[in-house]
Interface confidence: medium
């Protein structure tokens, strides 16, 4: 009944674990919500309590830590499953409290089934490798803390359903998988299965990640504006629609923000009174190079609009470029009667 700082259900940390495998889940309070760690809290006399709500139920209940073979246990700020069962799926809450202080957070835990080829509804982390960049490695993720350093586990790597043995350019090296020279053909899902003994039992940890081969920084170039260019003139009569595409190629660059924008007479379109619309589309190559197209459209162009400067700008971590479109007013064909009159010397 006393007030407790309730951080609610932390759906950002949707935890997924495989059925029939060990899982260790740290209480998120200390990682994301509080400014002190578990040791400090414990020294200050605070107690960490765990409880859960089963899937499709509203009732919070304590976790049963008295199951055979200590299937579920708590150690410091970690909740352990050795191993998980499908019906462990639910919302778990960890609460830190003493007589004067209380703080709690809930998080969803989903126990997921996998098939013999490691396919499952699990959301997979993506690891990007640079194409043709020399030796690069991926490491079997999230296996720290499951066994002491004195235990030497066996690790088997798979690509899709196939055990990695005698692959041309992919070499298993314990917890690491080395790509001698990454190629598009290396795209796919890679799984490490870590097997280790504990108290006379054998446990397996399955970790799958997606490898995506992307453009190499060696090949990266500043943005390239394909359109507008010097070969195209936008010649329009007042009243016609003016459509100018700005098409820009961006090399893949890790964590780069690619931007494309138009200026009209040096101002952003939002800052001027012309009735202009801009539509953007984005496409990606196999190596995640990006082509952005922004089409500037003026439905009924005026002669004033045709005198303005239309410049497409692009920026990435590699640099900034700009290109003006060649816009001009169509010169109307001379009228026959006027030509005749001029021909006869009329003024």
């Amino acid at each position: 009944s006393e007030r407790c700082d309730d951080w609610g259900l932390d759906t950002m940390r949707q935890i997924q674990v495989f059925e029939d495998e060990p899982a260790r889940i740290k209480c998120p309070l200390f990682e994301h919500f509080l400014k002190f760690n578990y040791s400090t809290a414990h020294s200050a006399g605070l107690t960490l309590i765990w409880y859960w709500t089963r899937q499709d139920r509203d009732l919070e209940e304590p976790i049963n830590f008295r199951l055979p073979e200590n299937r579920i246990s708590k150690e410091k700020d970690v909740l352990w499953f050795r191993p998980t069962l499908l019906n462990d799926t639910g919302n778990y809450t960890c609460m830190l409290r003493n007589t004067t202080y209380c703080s709690k957070v809930a998080f969803p835990l989903e126990v997921v089934q996998k098939d013999s080829c490691f396919n499952s509804p699990m959301k997979l982390p993506v690891h990007k490798l640079y194409i043709e960049y020399g030796i690069q490695r991926i490491t079997c993720p999230n296996v720290d803390g499951y066994f002491p350093s004195s235990v030497k586990p066996t690790i088997t790597w798979y690509m899709g359903c196939y055990k990695i043995q005698n692959f041309n350019n992919v070499i298993p090296e314990g917890m690491n998988l080395s790509f001698l020279i990454a190629l598009i053909s290396n795209n796919g899902n890679y799984t490490c299965v870590v097997t280790y003994p504990e108290n006379g039992r054998t446990f397996h940890l399955t970790r799958t990640l997606t490898v995506k081969v992307v453009g190499s920084p060696k090949n990266a170039v500043p943005p390239v504006i394909h359109s507008p260019n010097d070969h195209v003139v936008y010649e329009k009569e007042p009243g016609e629609e003016l459509l100018i595409p700005c098409t820009v190629y961006f090399s893949f660059l890790m964590d780069s923000r690619n931007e494309v924008w138009w200026t009209i007479d040096g101002k952003k379109p939002d800052d001027i009174t012309i009735d202009v619309t801009i539509n953007e589309s984005i496409s990606h190559s196999r190596t995640e190079d990006e082509t952005r197209t922004q089409i500037l459209s003026i439905k009924k162009v005026t002669s004033e609009d045709l005198k303005r400067s239309y410049v497409c700008h692009a920026r990435s971590a590699k640099g900034e470029v700009a290109k003006a479109a060649k816009v001009k007013q169509k010169v109307p064909a001379p009228r026959y009667t006027v030509e005749l009159a001029c021909g006869f010397g009329a003024t």
Epitope: S227, V233, I244, P245, T247, Y249, T291, I295
Partner: antibody, heavy 123, light 112 residues
Framework: QVQLVQSGAEVKKPGASVKVSCKAS????????MNWVRQAPGQGLEWVGQ????????YYAQKFQGRVTMTVDTSTSTVYMELSSLRSEDTAVYYC????????????????WGQGTLVTVSS | DIQLTQSPSSLSASVGDRATITCRAS??????????MHWYQQKPGKAPKLLIK???DLESGVPSRFSGSGSGTDFTLTISSVQPEDFATYYC??????????FGQGTKLEIK
Amino acid sequence: QVQLVQSGAEVKKPGASVKVSCKASGYIFITYWMNWVRQAPGQGLEWVGQIFPASGTTYYAQKFQGRVTMTVDTSTSTVYMELSSLRSEDTAVYYCARTDFYRYDGGYALDYWGQGTLVTVSS
Amino acid sequence: DIQLTQSPSSLSASVGDRATITCRASQSVSTSGYSSMHWYQQKPGKAPKLLIKYASDLESGVPSRFSGSGSGTDFTLTISSVQPEDFATYYCHHSWGIPMYTFGQGTKLEIK
């Protein structure tokens, strides 16, 4: 997916004109150059010219200057190639082909092609 | 205008053979970082299909037995192990400088 669908075969008399169409779908039509390439029976490929749909800007191979006209209808995503003063040596399959975009500014390849339109010029 | 000369004009090969076609440009079609030379495959009654762009970049969906190399004026298309579906005519194509494109005269790859 990108598709270029051309109009059907034509039989014309020498001196006449022919207008071939190419309807594009599956991409932003106005932002890619469209080319026309022809191939006479048993011969190689010959570039006729190109048009940029957003502006209607055209470039024609020297050989066809004055005889070829390329136009565009952006409302239907269709390009047209009209060849006038036809002669028997204009008998060929005419292809429309889109240029790709790449990391380089220019020198584009032709990445998608129509199925071709056979134009026969015979008296 | 830049002229392209392909050799040989025809080539006989057996399934599994390595096949090489060369294309020579009358002047350089390369600049810093890339070459405007592309390769196409054409089967009878069909439209050409892009295989290699910018001298060495394999087009998406094209088998890796196809490769391209070269720069400046001399370029090569190689099929590392010819398959039955590879018997066709191959064209080189340059797009150096808008607005003039030219094609090589073609090389017919035939079954030995």
